[in-house]
């Protein structure tokens, strides 16, 4: 006869481990008892249980409630046991010793491998700002046994680097993703992907990139100068910019206060029916936490009753200031 067993038994942390030990013998052979032991290179041998054909299962008190026989039906030649709720400390070598009649004794060893699935965590890097050089976007850490694989899934161009720390019963892997921030990356997903034999599928954590920027400001509304005539209603100037965080807008007049009736509504400056009083230099101020920008335009309101007054061009200028 011979013992049927496994070289390696793999189980996920918290699951029950079946330690197999089946005696394959002649029909007239009997198994009298099966002894199970843990074999540790440092501690030596620790008896786990004795499975006796007459007296049943006897378990080392240190393993009480953790070692059981598999559920029925059970073959009398099957000396397998269940180790309930496997923990990392259970990992190691196990031995079954089978006493048979009349063939004598047999023994076999197997290794129990306890997989500890990782629980990954993603930590965003410092705030990203357009204009920075290579910057840490995020780091992702996962600890498990064996060491997990940590990679990144993203359309964003960047570099990834990994390092691992080995602990007595596990390994922690940290991967960092670096990039050169640009506004095109705003809102793009950066996904940490953790693979491990103890996971049925990869674990994924997604971080949405936010890159602080502020675009140049410009003013729209003066494209057709002929519209800016005395008496015209609904004339507006709109300040154009974009940024992250979204910018705030403010309007001022360079050569004095805003004329009566001129209303500021966010990025838009609304005029009442135009008069020559509305002529002047208007400044749009755009700002967010990163920077501020200005754009100024000269408005000349034409009086049809005064054809001698001509304006060839509306002038505009742009300025910006970084916080």
């Amino acid at each position: 006869g011979e013992l049927e067993t496994s070289d390696v038994v793999t189980v996920v942390l918290g699951q029950d481990a079946k330690l197999p030990c089946f005696y394959r013998g002649d029909p007239d052979e009997q198994v009298g008892q099966v002894a199970w032991a843990r074999v540790d290179p440092n501690e030596g041998i620790r008896e786990l249980a004795l499975l006796h054909s007459k007296y049943g299962l006897h378990v080392n008190p240190a393993y009480e409630d953790r070692v059981e026989q598999p559920p029925p039906p059970r073959d009398p030649l099957d000396g397998s046991v269940l180790l309930r709720n496997a923990v990392q400390a259970d990992e190691g070598e196990y031995e079954c010793r089978v006493s048979t009649f009349p063939a004598g004794s047999f023994q076999a060893r197997m290794r129990l491998r306890v997989l500890v699935p990782p629980l990954p965590s993603l930590n965003p890097g410092p705030p990203l700002e357009e204009g920075q050089g290579l910057t840490l976007a995020a780091s992702c850490t996962a600890e498990g046994s064996p060491a997990p694989s940590v990679t990144w899934d993203t359309e964003v161009k960047g570099t990834q680097s990994s390092r691992s720390f080995t602990h007595p019963r596990s390994a922690a892997v940290t991967s960092e993703f670096h990039l050169v921030p640009s506004r095109s990356m705003n809102g793009q997903p950066l996904t940490c992907v953790v693979s491990h034999p103890g996971l049925l599928q990869d674990r994924r954590i997604t971080h949405t990139l936010q890159v602080a920027f502020l675009a140049e400001a410009s003013v729209r509304g003066l494209e057709d100068q002929n519209l800016w005539q005395v008496g015209r209603e609904g004339a507006t100037l709109k300040c154009l910019s974009e940024g992250q965080p979204p910018p705030k807008y403010n309007w001022t007049r360079l050569d004095g206060p805003l004329p009566s009736g001129v209303r500021v509504k966010g990025d838009t400056l609304g005029f009442p029916p135009l008069t020559t009083e509305h002529s002047g230099v208007y400044v749009c101020h755009v700002s967010n936490e990163l920077s501020s920008r200005d754009s100024q335009v000269t408005v000349e309101v034409l009086d049809p009753e005064d054809p001698g007054k001509q304006v060839d061009l509306v002038s505009a200028s742009h300025h910006h200031h970084h916080h």
Partner: antibody, heavy 121, light 107 residues
Framework: EVQLVQSGAEVKKPGSSVKVSCKAS????????MHWVRQAPGQGLEWMGW????????NYAQKFQGRVTMTRDTSISTAYMELRSLRSDDTAVYYC??????????????WGQGTLVTVSS | DIVMTQSPSSLSASVGDRVTITCRAS??????LNWYQQKPGKAPKLLIY???SLQSGVPSRFSGSGSGTDFTLTISSLQPEDFATYYC?????????FGQGTKVEIK
């Protein structure tokens, strides 16, 4: 300090029964198996069986099956071995011995002082 | 049942001598072999378990070796308190069985 204290010597008639006690102290009684080993005068050691004090489960050597019963009373941390249908060749010193933590069913790390049972008509 | 055979049955030695006792199992018992010391009128005392592991509190002059079927207990330098009877015992399977003992006497 671990101690196993056994009951005193007994003289019994053939065919009668004897019950030997073993009181444990200095450790958690239910955390270790208790074995019984006997030694006839001038002879070697002979294993009789064990009891798991926690569950009450037993395992007896085939030689003693049907004649021996091992029990325990966890409230007083005491194990008992009763041997029935005594014969003159049962005259021996009977020891209780604690199974070790690592080798619960096969290594005896502490022993009682022994109880001499004499079977004589 | 596994039969354990010790040799010699008895030996005479002097204080300071190196003493070796052998134990043979009727079948392979791996390293499931233990040694006990017994003095007259006293209970046995565990010396060595798992063939070579020294029980806590036992002097280091005692050592055990062997695997499979052949095992040895060695006392490197015999002391006056070591004169006693020594038993081997297998814990490979039940019934647990002992050797017949080796009596170490003063020469």
């Amino acid at each position: 300090e671990v101690q196993l204290v056994q009951s005193g010597a007994e003289v019994k008639k053939p065919g009668s029964s004897v019950k030997v006690s073993c009181k444990a102290s200095g450790y958690t009684f239910t955390g270790y198996y208790m074995h019984w080993v006997r030694q006839a005068p001038g002879q070697g050691l002979e294993w009789m069986g064990w009891i798991n004090p926690n569950s009450g489960g037993t395992n007896y050597a085939q030689k003693f099956q049907g004649r021996v019963t091992m029990t325990r009373d966890t409230s007083i941390s005491t194990a008992y071995m009763e041997l029935r249908s005594l014969r003159s060749d049962d005259t021996a010193v009977y020891y209780c011995a604690r199974g070790s933590a690592l080798h619960f069913f096969g290594v005896f790390d502490y022993w009682g002082q022994g109880t001499l049972v004499t079977v004589s008509s | 049942d596994i039969v354990m055979t010790q040799s010699p049955s008895s030996l005479s030695a002097s204080v300071g001598d190196r003493v070796t006792i052998t134990c043979r199992a009727s079948q392979s018992i791996s390293s499931y072999l233990n040694w006990y010391q017994q003095k007259p009128g006293k209970a046995p005392k565990l010396l060595i378990y798992a063939a070579s592991s020294l029980q806590s509190g036992v002097p280091s002059r005692f050592s055990g070796s062997g695997s499979g079927t052949d095992f040895t207990l060695t006392i490197s330098s015999l002391q006056p308190e070591d004169f006693a009877t020594y038993y081997c015992q297998q814990s490979y399977s039940t019934p647990l069985t002992f050797g017949q003992g080796t009596k170490v006497e003063i020469k």
